[in-house]
């Protein structure tokens, strides 16, 4: 059993049918040493008397809001909620595995440029009775301050019959430098409390692999004299890190027609402007990478041909 | 202000073009390592992230682009000093900080360069031949260094008279690897930056 | 006592189907996660399906993928694997098992696929 | 489609010190826990040891389990007849967990 905060604790429990459970110690917050009952959440029902408690926790009947009272007077409270360890492996009911960029991956984290600012995000198919924490540092023996905001549902989409909630949090690193090289990587985790059952999630990463540009920006086409060909031109989105001599970006313009099936003609340069032949219903799409490390492109910034 | 970089002019700044060589190189030969041996821990979640240069050079600190020297977490520890006879200077009046940084970033390919020789002699010697060094990156890697032409002490290659243990040998190359792909992100960032001003 | 008893077994066409069913006792069935795992003749253990305690996730081998169909009725506390489009290799003794660090297993129950 | 590898067969006279061992790779057993099973002829397999090395009560103590890095091995001392069977590892793979990986199996004769 450890402290989550203050008067909540979480008990650790192997979980499997007809497991012993975990005895666990409760101590009444009060210098009252005679007089005392307990009870469990909303009942009036008795558990026992005196200054502690001992219970048998088996299964979530016996989590919940222990309070120790005294002639009707409430003297405090103690809230036991459950972590599961099922066969070594610790329960992960309440958030989704999104499955990318491979299986088991519950939180997904971002960043638009190397300022030591990142977003994560995560699903859930809980609508109710829900509650994270967020907490995030740069390496774990010896950790360095990164500030992370609340959690916020941020989307709502409908699957199938299910109805998905997807939260998110962004953070910070305290003192960054865009050109450092990483050599300890950033660790995120988050609680995930639902009911009475706690959950933990640990995500742990490198900014320069969560790298994901935002679109170029300022898109525009200009028809040249005489031809079929347009130059089209762009700029350095603004949230990308500068000096842009420095944090080069590298290009991908992409002409695409209105059906689908259509080939898709594609040129990648390291300049912000291009000459394309532009046909006929087509779009002219462009997005930005990281020239030097490869991690995601960003989405694509588009303008019609005509 | 956007400078993209187009196909470097070789007279205008010569090293570009061999930085871009070596990110390519190295990229190339971590790939192939990663796949070669699948069986290791050799991707980037998996191995210690070790900095051979680190305390030696400072090229990230030296090579700090202008507009980065405002943003404080960024100047850690610049006081390392080097010599300074850079050929890749295309100007005379190149500052003291451009010829550190060069200089920096020649140092670090002097010790790169020396660890992969002592380790390819070692990987010679698996009767597995499981894996080998890309000559093409030793090869790059020279290049670069005599194109920032630096006078500097040749450090002696490393020779070890115990058995190597392939296992561990194999594990360091990926520790390398990944710490040198990293370093030429830096050099590249840093030429195109040099090249742009 | 936890008990895990398991019916339907028995013999079937190729291309027929089956349900097994697994009806669980002396324990809190609702909580916990549940497995299939099958041992073809003279063969070893091989796993074909897994529930999450309340439904709400379901994996499968590849080998039964799309043909076979994990549930659970909790209100039962019955466990089933309803499988279809039964092939020779599905031939097999059929487990159902709890989820946990100890498990319980039922008894098994023959499924023989033959023409 | 089996991961984890256990040899065909082992064999013992009564009281000699019998091992089986369970060759997996980083993201399965390096990763996670080991079970053991034992299975009789004709009956469901029966949990010998869970956590690589703990033994569930009812288990006599001439078994005992360990890991090391991507194997895991099991051990029975002083063999008896009773322990003729066959003999299953069990462990997850961290990509497909709770998929069951099950070794090849390793029948036991007592000579």
């Known amino acids: 059993i450890w402290e989550l905060k203050k008067d909540v604790y979480v008990v650790e429990l192997d979980w499997y049918p007809d497991a012993p459970g975990e005895m666990v110690v409760l101590t009444c917050d009060t210098p009252e040493e005679d007089g005392i009952t307990w009870t469990l959440d909303q009942s009036s029902e008795v558990l026992g008397s005196g200054k502690t408690l001992t219970i048998q926790v088996k299964e979530f009947g016996d989590a919940g809001q222990y309070t120790c009272h005294k002639g009707g007077e409430v003297l405090s409270h103690s809230l036991l909620l459950l972590h599961k360890k099922e066969d070594g492996i610790w329960s992960t009911d309440i958030l989704k595995d999104q499955k990318e960029p491979k299986n088991k991956t519950f939180l997904r984290c971002e960043a638009k440029n190397y300022s030591g600012r990142f977003t994560c995000w995560w699903l859930t198919t809980i609508s109710t009775d829900l509650t994270f924490s967020v907490k995030s540092s740069r390496g774990s023996s010896d950790p360095q301050g990164v500030t992370c905001g609340a959690a916020t549902l941020s989307a709502e989409r409908v699957r199938g019959d299910n109805k998905e909630y997807e939260y998110s949090v962004e953070c910070q690193e305290d003192s960054a430098c865009p050109a450092a090289e990483e050599s300890l990587p950033i660790e995120v985790m988050v609680d995930a409390v639902h009911k009475l059952k706690y959950e933990n999630y640990t995500s742990s990463f490198f900014i320069r692999d969560i790298i994901k540009p935002d679109p170029p920006k300022n898109l525009q086409l200009k028809p040249l004299k005489n031809s079929r060909q347009v130059e089209v031109s762009w700029e350095y989105p603004d949230t990308w890190s500068t000096p842009h001599s420095y944090f080069s970006l590298t290009f991908c313009v992409q002409v695409q027609g209105k059906s689908k099936r259509e080939k898709k003609d594609r040129v990648f340069t390291d300049k912000t402007s291009a000459t394309v032949i532009c046909r006929k219903n087509a779009s002219i799409s462009v997005r930005a990478q990281d020239r030097y490390y490869s991690s995601s492109w960003s989405e694509w910034a588009s303008v019609p041909c005509s | 202000r956007n400078l993209p970089v187009a196909t470097p002019d070789p007279g205008m700044f010569p090293c570009l073009h061999h930085s871009q060589n070596l990110l390519r190189a190295v990229s190339n030969m971590l790939q192939k390592a990663r796949q070669t041996l699948e069986f290791y821990p050799c991707t980037s979640e998996e191995i210690d992230h070790e900095d051979i240069t680190k305390d030696k050079t400072s090229t990230v600190e030296a090579c700090l682009p202008l507009e980065l020297t405002k943003n404080e977490s960024c100047l850690n520890s610049r006081e390392t000093s080097f010599i300074t006879n850079g050929s890749c200077l295309a100007s005379r009046k190149t500052s003291f900080m451009m010829a550190l940084c060069l200089s920096s970033i020649y140092e670090d390919l002097k010790m790169y360069q020396v660890e992969f020789k002592t380790m390819n002699a070692k990987l010679l010697m698996d009767p597995k031949r499981q894996i080998f060094l890309d000559q093409n990156m030793l090869a790059v890697i020279d290049e670069l260094m005599q194109a920032l032409n630096f006078n500097s002490e040749t450090v002696p290659q490393k020779s070890s008279l115990e058995e190597p243990d392939f296992y561990k040998t194999k594990i360091k190359l990926c520790i390398l690897l990944h710490a040198f792909r990293i370093r030429a992100v830096t050099i590249d960032r840093v030429m195109s930056y040099l090249n742009a001003s | 006592q936890v008990q895990l008893v398991q019916s339907g077994g028995g013999v079937v066409q190729p291309g027929r189907s089956l349900r097994l069913s697994c009806a669980a006792s002396?324990?809190?069935?609702?909580?916990?996660?549940m497995h299939w795992v099958r041992q073809a003749p003279g063969k070893g253990l091989e796993w074909v399906a897994f529930i999450r305690y309340d439904g709400s996730n379901k994996y499968y081998a590849d080998s039964v993928k799309g043909r076979f169909t994990i549930s659970r009725d909790n209100s039962k506390n019955t466990l089933y694997l309803q499988m279809k489009s039964l092939r020779a290799e599905d031939t097999a003794v059929y487990y159902c098992?709890?989820?946990?660090?100890?498990?319980?297993w039922g008894q098994g129950t023959m499924v023989t696929v033959s023409s | 489609s089996y991961v984890l590898t256990q040899p065909p067969s082992v064999s013992g006279t009564p009281g000699q010190r019998v091992t089986i061992s369970c060759s997996g790779g980083?993201?399965?057993?390096?990763?996670?826990?080991v079970k053991w099973y034992q299975q009789l002829p004709g009956t469901a397999p029966k949990l010998l040891i869970y956590?690589?090395?703990q033994r569930p009560s009812g288990v006599p103590d001439r078994f005992s389990g360990s890991k090391s890095g991507t194997s895991a091995s099991l051990a029975i001392t002083g063999v008896q007849a009773e322990d003729e069977a066959d003999y299953y590892c069990?462990?997850?793979?961290?990509?497909?967990?709770?998929?069951?990986?099950f070794g090849t199996g390793t029948k036991v004769t007592v000579l």
């Open positions: 002396g324990f809190t069935f609702s909580s916990y996660g």
């Open positions: 956590g690589n090395d």
């Open positions: 098992k709890t989820h946990g660090s100890h498990d319980n």
């Open positions: 980083r993201s399965n057993i390096g990763y996670n826990t």
């Open positions: 069990q462990s997850y793979d961290r990509g497909t967990h709770p998929a069951l990986l």
